[in-house]
Interface confidence: low
């Protein structure tokens, strides 16, 4: 069965950092492309960042392009996404999902998601 | 960006009826050389993730029910629900994987009209 | 080192066909998507094919499509193929064999189409 | 499909001089990919995602740009820069080159 648990959310001033891991298990890690899709409070779906099942291959929405960075670890299966200079619009519910091939397609499975909250 | 407009944003459908719901890209989604869509729709229950229900525009997710069916083509795509049930109250999206990057509609809220 | 040699090419009538090779080594084949680029005698780029990683999914440009069929071998040879039919003059080029992202090429095999 | 369009198509610069050249987009995209040539040798990859530098890439070269405009900029011209520099975008299939900039020196 496809896991994917996602971690390292919290609580950040604005200007800070976090680094968001996803664990994933169940299927071969490295032949799949993953992506981060973000979900503010009551608020619809945004794609943030995908990243080619080889990781050779990476993907920025243009709200975080240079302050986020994805990346993997194949021989760990798991999925990062490096924060920096944080916003208030930041604030949101992070999923990590896999999608259905190694490119990046539609996305078949989804973590439980990790909240991260910028605040002063 | 390809922008992505859903409607309506929210439909109230009695119980065994059918539920539509359109999806407008602002430019084409299909890959010619492969003649497939690149369109995905997605069903989102409170306090849930997202969960896959069609892909390539017509394609129905592992496990997704047979009176969930995605159509269209180019600009124009619809989610049909054949026969609503009480387990389909949920936001549904669709999302485009044609370019990067990557975009969903605003949401269309499916509710079960007393 | 990463290396991509192309082989295959050479002179062929119009409405011939040919298959072209890239074998790879010095990366975990595999792993990478892989593209093949031309370059016509002009000089003008142009992306070909592309195919995932593990074969199963393909794309062309629409001046290809249904006359080149792009595969791969992940288990043999690390070898990449694109196979060629109905072949036309202006599909003389210098066909490049290339790695996801196209940092990697290779040098290139030329296919010439001419009565 | 995505068309990529260079200017200027040829141009010649002195050694120390500055040099931009640009590649224009017909639908708005992510990114860009810059890739060098030099007569009878394949392309190689010099800038990669708008604005990265390719490995062994001297660090006068940079790349800049969003939406449907976008350029590599030497900062100081040198005999060896002289090449034709093609932009790639990769956001959306079928994936497409600029027609190229070359680029002599004076």
């Known amino acids: 069965e496809v896991q994917l648990l996602e971690s390292g959310g919290g609580l950040v001033q604005p200007g800070g950092s976090l680094r968001l891991s996803c664990a994933a298990s169940g299927f071969t890690f490295s032949g799949y492309a993953m992506t981060w899709v973000r979900q503010a409070p009551g608020k619809g779906l945004k794609w943030v960042s995908g990243i080619s099942g080889s990781g050779g291959s990476t993907y920025y929405a243009a709200s975080v392009k240079g302050r986020f960075t994805i990346s993997r670890d194949n021989s760990k299966s798991t999925l990062y996404l490096q924060m920096n200079s944080l916003r208030a619009e930041d604030t949101a519910v992070y999923y990590c999902a896999k999608t259905i091939n190694d490119i990046l397609t539609a996305t078949e499975d989804w973590g439980q998601g990790t909240l991260v909250t910028v605040s002063s | 960006d390809i922008v992505m407009t859903q409607s309506p944003d929210s439909l109230a459908v009695s119980l065994g009826e059918r539920a539509t719901i359109n999806c407008k890209t602002s430019q084409s989604v299909l890959y010619s050389s492969k003649k497939k869509n690149y369109l995905a729709w997605y069903q989102q229950k409170p306090g849930q993730p997202p969960k896959l229900v069609i892909y390539w525009a017509s394609t129905r997710g592992s496990g997704v029910p047979d009176r969930f069916s995605g159509s269209g083509s180019g600009t124009d795509f619809t989610l049909t629900i054949s026969s609503l049930q009480a387990e389909d109250v949920a936001v549904y999206y669709c999302q485009q994987y044609y370019s990067t990057p990557q975009t969903f509609g605003q949401g269309t809220k499916v509710e079960i009209k007393r | 080192e990463v290396q991509l040699v192309e082989s295959g090419g050479g002179l062929v009538k119009p409405g011939g066909s040919l298959k072209l090779s890239c074998t790879a080594s010095?990366?975990?084949?595999?792993?990478?998507?892989m593209s093949w680029v031309r370059q016509s005698p002009e000089k003008r780029l142009e992306w070909v094919a592309e195919?995932?990683?593990?074969?199963?999914?393909?794309?062309y440009s629409d001046t290809v499509t249904g006359r080149f069929s792009i595969s791969r071998d992940n288990a043999k040879n690390s070898t990449l193929y694109l196979e060629m039919n109905s072949l036309r003059s202006e599909d003389t080029a210098i066909y490049y064999c290339a790695r996801e992202t196209t940092g990697t090429w290779g040098q290139g095999t030329l296919v010439t189409v001419s009565a | 499909q995505i068309v990529l369009t260079q200017s200027p198509a040829i141009m010649s610069a002195s050694p120390g001089e500055k040099v931009t050249m640009t590649c224009s987009v017909s639908?708005?995209?992510?990114?860009m990919h810059w890739f060098r040539q030099k007569p009878g040798t394949s392309p190689k990859l010099w800038i990669y995602?708008?604005?990265n530098l390719a490995s062994g890439v001297p660090a006068r070269f940079s790349g800049s740009g969003s939406g449907t405009s976008y350029s590599l900029t030497i900062s100081r011209m040198e005999a060896e820069d002289a090449a034709t520099y093609y932009c790639?975008?990769?956001?959306?299939?079928?994936?497409?080159f600029g027609s190229g900039t070359k680029l002599e020196i004076k």
């Open positions: 010095g990366f975990t084949f595999s792993s990478y998507a």
């Open positions: 790639q975008q990769r956001s959306r299939y079928p994936f497409t």
């Open positions: 195919i995932s990683s593990g074969g199963i999914h393909t794309y």
């Open positions: 639908s708005s995209i992510t990114y």
């Open positions: 995602t708008t604005s």
